[in-house]
Interface confidence: low
Amino acid sequence: NWVNVISDLKKIEDLIQSMHIDATLYTESDVHPSCKVTAMKCFLLELQVISLESGDASIHDTVENLIILANNSLSSNGNVTESGCKECEELEEKNIKEFLQSFVHIVQMFINTS
């Protein structure tokens, strides 16, 4: 499932190339392993901004699919309780390109520990 999430992220990267979206997104670029689930939820929350800003049906569908895949993968890990993690809005704001790169990085963390 996480591999499919990366495929969707690459698809989103390709789709936004031709668009001018100047939104900045809360991005965790240095994910601590003990906060990776919390960080992933922030990424999923912010991903909706891309869908919203683009106004593009293909991006919307890909984002929706990615969120479902990620949720299924998260729930297969069971209910993980993390403490002392940053809230989404405490994170640094980055452009979409940097956001997507960091998103791929955190997904790779999940792949490496699954």
């Epitope: 809360y26 689930v37 939820k41 922030c42 929350l45 912010e46 909706q48 901004v49 919203l52 929706e64 969120i67 479902i68 990620a70 949720n71 299924n72 998260l74 729930s75 890990n77 069971g78 209910n79 993980v80 309780t81 809230e87 989404c88 809005e89």
Partner: antibody, heavy 118, light 105 residues
């Protein structure tokens, strides 16, 4: 069409337990958070807590921590709010709402009126 | 915990007038995480504005939101009879808080 349909009004006695429900349709239940909001008679909105049905991660407002339990059943796309021992001060309208873009509450249930009286 | 204070508590205006509702936060709030809701008697709240200035689906353009940091404003440019209701601001995101409400009558 996104819909959140809440269970019907309840009349209970102090000390009794209660579980009210919020059945959602029109979107993937695990994709969005579901929040609960209390509105006491003639008063404003009070945030109680929120659940992420994808993995049942639950966050409570400090004011409601330990007072209520929020849960969800993915198999039937339903969120719940429950009390183990009701008090008269729990008399209120309770709303469930979907955490949409950036998690604001974009769709709301119609509300469940809970009356606790001896 | 962030506290949101709305003013005025009650605003009395006539149809056709402009209404300006204020929401002040006890500490800085990202504008991405500030919303406004409308609630009419006997009804559930309805989302009007999110991200401080974005109108929710189906909301008329006479409703607009603005502000940043600790001060946010909801403006209704030309009041219609159906706009008389209670309005709430909300800070959302990973934690949530509502203001106490402004009654527009």
């Amino acid at each position: 069409e996104v819909q959140l349909v809440q269970s019907g009004a309840e009349v209970k006695k102090p000390g009794e337990s209660l579980k009210i429900s919020c059945k959602v349709s029109g979107y993937f239940f695990t994709t969005y958070w579901i929040g609960w909001v209390r509105q006491m008679p003639g008063k404003g909105l009070e945030y109680m807590g929120i659940i992420y049905p994808g993995d049942s991660d639950t966050r409570y407002s400090p004011s409601f921590q330990g007072q209520v339990t929020i849960s969800a059943d993915k198999s039937i796309s339903t969120a719940y709010l429950q009390w183990s021992s009701l008090k008269a001060s729990d008399t209120a309208m309770y709303y469930c709402a979907r955490g949409g873009n950036w998690n604001c509450f974009d769709y709301w249930g119609q509300g469940t009126l809970v009356t606790v009286s001896s | 915990e962030i506290v949101l204070t709305q003013s005025p508590g009650t605003l009395s205006l006539s149809p056709g007038r402009e209404a300006t509702l204020s929401c002040r936060a006890s500490q800085s709030v990202s504008s991405s995480y500030l919303a406004w809701y409308q609630q009419k008697p006997g009804q559930a709240p309805r989302l009007l504005i999110y991200g401080a200035s974005r109108r929710a689906t189906g909301i008329p353009d006479r409703f607009s939101g603005s502000g940043s940091g600790t001060d946010f404003t909801l403006t209704i440019s030309r009041l219609e009879p159906e706009d008389f209701a209670v309005y709430y601001c909300q800070r959302y995101g990973s934690s949530h808080t509502f203001g106490q409400g402004t009654k527009l009558e």
